[in-house]
């Protein structure tokens, strides 16, 4: 029958070429010659040429080896024509089949492969894949089956089995204990790739096993011991550093130092900071020290990582003795700010307040008082006992120097240390009110009009405080009452001053006096422009002129 | 000579907690992970719980996950199995042995650990 | 159920040779070489007696012997004597948290 099975042909053939394959043959031949032909890629298109057929007898030849890994397979159609060109038969599928040598070698992708795993992992834990490829075939024959295998590891420390590979997959895994970043931060692996599923050809690569730092050890104090003398009272004053060292990775969290006071800071009088660059903890004052209370300190410092502990392990502390200095320190005034009270106006040479300080150092030194500010300059202290008194008028009401009633002033206190050393407190004289100033109207000018006047509502103020003020009195002297009467309303805080007979247009004083609550009498002359109108008025009109 | 020596086991009603130890001697202690095995009686061994060599890293049979701990100390040349909330299926003899690359060698002689009410 | 699986039991006469098979994966027997033999006698501890597929710790006979093909390990014992009767467990390496995968088992019997 004009059919041809699938012809398979072994590539990498020796020849000699051509080389016969297989024969066409059409059964016609016994009525006419047959002329035999192929077309298709391989034969009349591109690769040309690969494979003829010998046109009378139909043998199909093959030119030249095959490569499985160019063309694995061929398609032809073989033709078979009578000697006048008409075809005999229907053109007849030839499929050609290149069967696989094992002629290439495996190839890793890459030349070095780099993986990573943590250290102190405990065996199956996976790091890295590598992967190989073989260009022959892997589905009918092992030629392109590819085994994996480690061929050696370097350094082979602690063990020369660290790691394996999957012999299929190519994924590397630990399978020993003891990776230890600290002794080893690196592995080498020569990595085979065997093809024919390990005993082929094989090829090698390298693959680089970086060991990833795990916080596996603990920062220790490198001295443990430290003596540091401290000023009293310094604050923020850097006390020690103190020097960790740490086998783990510089510069990472598992490196980096937490300090904590653990012990012997009872005041709560220090604090201890990590340094940047170099690590240290520096122990600072937090707050002053005080030689006389405490002349030493006994620390105990714990340091730690910023990242946990993946283990157990033991921390470690140091004692830092700390000494404090003894200083020349000023004296204190007590209170540190002193209020008294006094009346204002007190007579000259009155004694006000006795203000001292007292020495926080155990020697006796001597003290010496002086006033520092004294805005008035209503005070002098005696320089020996502190004894403040009065040398000007105090005065309650002098807006430029009191305050809500209180006259400030900073006195200082200095021993006669070497250097010698000065402090400050402030006395506040809450000076209490004396009847010494009489109620005063406002306005003290009016306008008014001569008919139909207005009532001139006067507001009336006294400098001094309840009960030196309101209900506040009126009364008209100097025969101002002939022509105006004066009354204080209800409240007592305003007076009312009316006209009552007709005056004519000019200017008067009228002569009110205003008594306070205390009976303290003030006399004061109200300017009175009294105009030609009726009512209401601000200012007097012009004269009138008629037309 | 390289030895493991187990202690610990004992009788424990069901829910109790028993915890087991391996001394360790004769090799470098902390270079290699530890693991607990168990043989239930009349059947087949069953790996129970694996340690690195510095104790950063464990592993559990699903069977013990969240009930069993293990630990060590390898200042002390020992390793331990905390076990709680102990059930009849944990009667087993315990066996400490040494994780050798792909090997569990050497072995303990093993402790008994009896859950019964 | 164990991972790896071995047969029940086995038997042989003094002097006759016997293999114990071990069937995995592809991703434990199959993968990695490092299959291991113990033998436990009764009431004893396990000792090994082969590691990475066929290597002998010194003091161990050399008529154990191991062979591995494909997913399969087997363990042969040749020369049967009456002190080889015991269980026998085979192990295998495996990537994951479950390192090591253990067999159910094999009991030798010397008749």
């Known amino acids: 029958d004009w059919v041809v099975a699938p012809i398979s042909v072994p590539e990498n053939g020796k020849g000699p070429f051509p080389q016969r394959l297989n024969q066409l043959k059409s059964n016609k031949d016994r009525d006419t010659k047959i002329f035999y032909s192929i077309t298709g890629p391989g034969a009349d298109s591109p690769p040309e040429g690969v494979f003829a057929v010998e046109k009378e007898t139909g043998w199909l030849l093959l030119n030249k080896p095959l490569d499985r890994e160019e063309i694995a397979k061929y398609e032809l159609f073989g033709h078979a024509v009578s000697e006048n060109g008409a075809s005999v038969e229907d053109p007849m599928n030839i499929s050609i089949i290149v069967t696989d040598q094992n002629d290439h070698k495996p190839k890793f992708t890459q030349d070095t492969f780099r993986g990573s795993v943590l250290e102190g992992v405990l065996p199956g834990t996976s790091v890295m894949q590598v992967t190989a490829t073989d260009e022959d075939d892997a589905i009918y024959t092992y030629n392109g089956v590819v085994a994996y295998s480690i061929h050696s590891q370097e350094p082979k420390d602690p063990h020369d089995l660290m790691f394996t590979i999957h012999r299929s997959t190519g994924t590397i895994s630990v399978i020993s204990s003891g990776l230890d970043r600290e002794k080893v931060p690196e592995y080498t692996l020569t990595i085979q790739a065997t093809d024919m599923d390990g005993d082929g050809s094989t090829t090698t690569a390298v693959a680089v096993v970086e060991i990833l730092d795990a916080n596996d050890n603990a920062p220790m104090f490198d001295p443990q011991k430290y003596e540091a003398h401290v000023p009293e009272n310094a604050v923020g004053h850097e006390v020690q550093r103190l020097t960790v060292t740490d086998l783990d990775a510089p510069n990472s969290p598992a490196w980096r130092a937490t300090y904590l006071i653990m012990g012997g800071d009872d005041g709560d009088h220090f604090t201890i900071t990590t340094h940047p660059e170099s690590n240290q903890g520096i122990l600072t004052t937090r707050k002053g020290l005080d030689f006389e209370a405490k002349n030493q300190h006994t620390l105990y410092v714990e340091v730690t990582n910023e990242a946990p502990f993946v283990l157990k392990l033991p921390t470690s502390t140091a004692t830092i003795v700390v000494h404090v200095e003894d200083v020349n320190e000023a004296p204190v005034f007590v209170p540190p700010s002193k209020v008294v009270e006094v009346q204002e106006g007190i007579p000259t040479g009155e004694p006000v307040c006795v203000y001292t300080a007292e020495d926080p150092d155990k020697e006796n030194q001597k003290i010496s008082y002086r006033i520092l500010r004294d805005p008035a300059g209503w005070l002098a202290m005696d320089p020996d006992s502190g004894q403040v008194t009065a040398v000007g008028t105090l005065d309650r009401e002098d807006e430029q120097f009191v305050r809500n009633n209180i006259y400030e002033v900073m006195v200082l206190a200095m021993d006669n240390g070497s250097p010698p050393t000065t402090g400050t407190g402030t006395l506040l004289l809450t000076l209490i009110d004396v009847n010494d100033h009489g109620p005063v109207p406002e306005p003290r000018q009016i306008t008014i009009c001569n008919q139909s006047p207005v009532r001139q509502v006067l507001n009336i103020t006294d400098k001094d405080l309840s009960p030196h003020t309101s209900p506040f009195q009126a009364q008209l002297t100097d025969d101002s009452d002939i022509y105006w009467t004066a009354e204080v309303n209800e409240e007592g805080d305003t007076v009312v001053l009316s006209l009552k007979k007709f005056l004519k247009q000019d200017t008067y004083d009228v002569h009110l006096s205003l008594s306070d609550h205390g009976n303290k009498e003030q006399l004061t002359v109200i300017r009175a422009t009294v105009c030609d109108c009726h009512g209401h008025v601000e200012t007097c009109p012009g004269p009138w002129k008629g037309g | 000579e390289v030895q493991l020596l187990e202690s610990g086991g004992g009788l424990v009603q069901p829910g109790g907690s028993l915890r087991l130890s391996c001394a360790a001697s004769?090799?470098?202690?902390?270079?290699?992970?530890m693991s607990w095995v168990r043989q239930a009686p009349g059947k087949g061994l069953e790996w129970v719980s694996a340690?690195?060599?510095?104790?950063?890293?464990?592993y559990y049979a699903d069977s013990v996950k969240g009930r069993f701990t293990i630990s060590r100390d390898n200042s002390k040349n020992t390793l331990y199995l905390q076990m709680n909330s102990l059930r009849a299926e944990d009667t087993a003899v315990y066996y400490c042995?040494?994780?050798?690359?792909?090997?569990?060698?050497?072995w303990g002689q093993g402790t008994m650990v009896t859950v019964s009410s | 159920q164990s991972a790896l699986t071995q047969p029940a039991s086995v038997s042989g006469s003094p002097g006759q040779s016997i293999t114990i098979s071990c069937t995995g994966t592809?991703?434990?027997?199959?993968?990695?070489?490092?299959v291991s033999w113990y033998q436990q006698h009764p009431g004893k501890a396990p000792k090994l007696i082969l590691s990475?597929?066929?290597k002998r710790p010194s003091g161990v006979s050399n008529r154990f012997s191991g062979s591995k093909s494909g997913n399969t390990a087997s363990l042969s014992i040749s020369g049967l004597q009456a002190e080889d009767e015991a269980d026998y467990y085979c192990?295998?390496?495996?990537?994951?948290?479950?390192?090591?995968?253990f067999g159910g088992g094999t009991k030798l019997t010397v008749l």
């Open positions: 340690i690195s060599g510095s104790g950063g890293s464990t």
């Open positions: 004769g090799f470098t202690f902390s270079s290699y992970a």
């Open positions: 042995a040494t994780n050798s690359p792909g090997t569990f060698d050497p």
């Open positions: 990475e597929v066929n």
């Open positions: 192990t295998s390496y495996t990537m994951g948290s479950t390192f090591m995968l």
């Open positions: 592809s991703n434990d027997v199959g993968a990695y070489n490092y």
